[in-house]
Interface confidence: low
Amino acid sequence: NFMYSKTVKRLSKLREYQQYHPSLTCVMEGKDIEDWSCCPTPWTSFQSSCYFISTGMQSWTKSQKNCSVMGADLVVINTREEQDFIIQNLKRNSSYFLGLSDPGGRRHWQWVDQTPYNENVTFWHSGEPNNLDERCAIINFRSSEEWGWNDIHCHVPQKSICKMKKIYI
């Protein structure tokens, strides 16, 4: 009876997310059969988040809108470990928008989810950011420094990375 009601709850929760994502991939967290964490198929998962690499080329604004339609945001990178995970899924000859922008061109960088911008956890390429008119951040590969961030014009189309919290059922 308990298992039945748990299953019914799960199904109703899954139905909630169907408008965004018709298919979810779920894994059992720990040893407790009750705890399942899910990411939309074919998103990847790391710790408590899901990630999607969008290969469509769009402006920063449209990239963020594209993520938001999927119930996500452009990626907010909180740790070196998170960045190391993300770059495994990126192509070296491409650039990807992050959820980081400087709307006023005053070097007041803001993450899309209002996470405080912490200078100690940033991965700018050397010499970046370097232009007050370049108000959006990308991650790209430079042979000398490998993967890092660069500021670019927000209207220039790029690929992007979306991030959302895992769905727990």
Epitope: S59, Q64, K65, S101, P103, G104, Q110, D113, Q114, K165
Partner: antibody, heavy 120, light 108 residues
């Protein structure tokens, strides 16, 4: 003092136009996305439009798309809403509001509003 | 578009009491929900953003909770100035940004 002051409202006949203005003071308008939100008499809030800090991106509610145009003049610290082909259901107090967060999801500073009455 | 439904439509309480206002979304909005307070003849004021973060200058008696489709605004001990209309607003899927229809908090 950080504030927004709307103007340009009034009584207008159906089908006519108005231009609403919102003057910002105490902060730099060019650093913020800006919204218009309206409220019909005795009713709830309805989001109308948003414009990005640089004016390059604009989004509208379906109910006003094609009739209303949001614009800004950062050099004058002023936001505008051009309202055309007005209908009775457009009667409302129109508020300008500053967007907070990126990209401007919530409204952290509001003007006192300007009343638009559409009546023949 | 995402529809937000607030309940109750009117809540009658006395100063000092605890107020619990509800906002339900027609589909999941994650934690991307804000609460506003509006007094008669005034513009709305941002209270809570992203479900549980208090906006600048908002007293600690205001708190928000919830995620997915069900959200709650709690005022732990009502002050006379708290009697007003409260709106929730989502930013999960836009445009449009949508508001609930409002809950009127009145003095009993």
């Amino acid at each position: 003092q950080v504030q927004l002051v709307e103007s340009g409202g009034g009584v207008v006949q159906p089908g006519r136009s108005l231009r609403l203005s919102c003057a910002a003071s105490g902060f730099t308008l060019s650093s913020y996305g800006m919204h218009w939100v309206r409220q019909a008499p005795g009713k709830g809030l309805e989001w109308v439009a948003v414009i990005w800090y640089d004016g390059n991106d604009k989004y509208y509610a379906d109910s006003v798309k094609g009739r209303f145009t949001i614009s800004r003049d950062n050099s004058k610290n002023t936001l505008y809403l051009q309202v055309n082909s007005l209908r009775a259901e457009d009667t409302a107090v129109y508020y300008c509001a500053r967007g907070t967060g990126t990209p401007y999801w919530y409204f952290d500073l509001w003007g006192r509003g300007t009343l638009v009455t559409v009546s023949s | 578009e995402i529809v937000l439904t607030q309940s109750p439509a009117t809540l009658s309480l006395s100063p000092g009491e605890r107020a619990t206002l509800s906002c339900r979304a027609s589909q999941s909005v994650n934690n991307y929900l804000a609460w506003y307070q509006q007094k008669p003849g005034q513009a709305p004021r941002l209270l809570i953003y992203d479900a549980s973060n208090r906006a600048t200058g908002i007293p600690a008696r205001f708190s928000g909770s919830g995620s997915g489709t069900d959200f709650t605004l709690t005022i732990s001990s009502l002050e006379p100035e708290d009697f007003a209309v409260y709106y929730c607003q989502q930013r999960s899927t836009w445009p449009p940004y949508t508001f609930g229809q409002g809950t009127k908090l009145e003095i009993k």
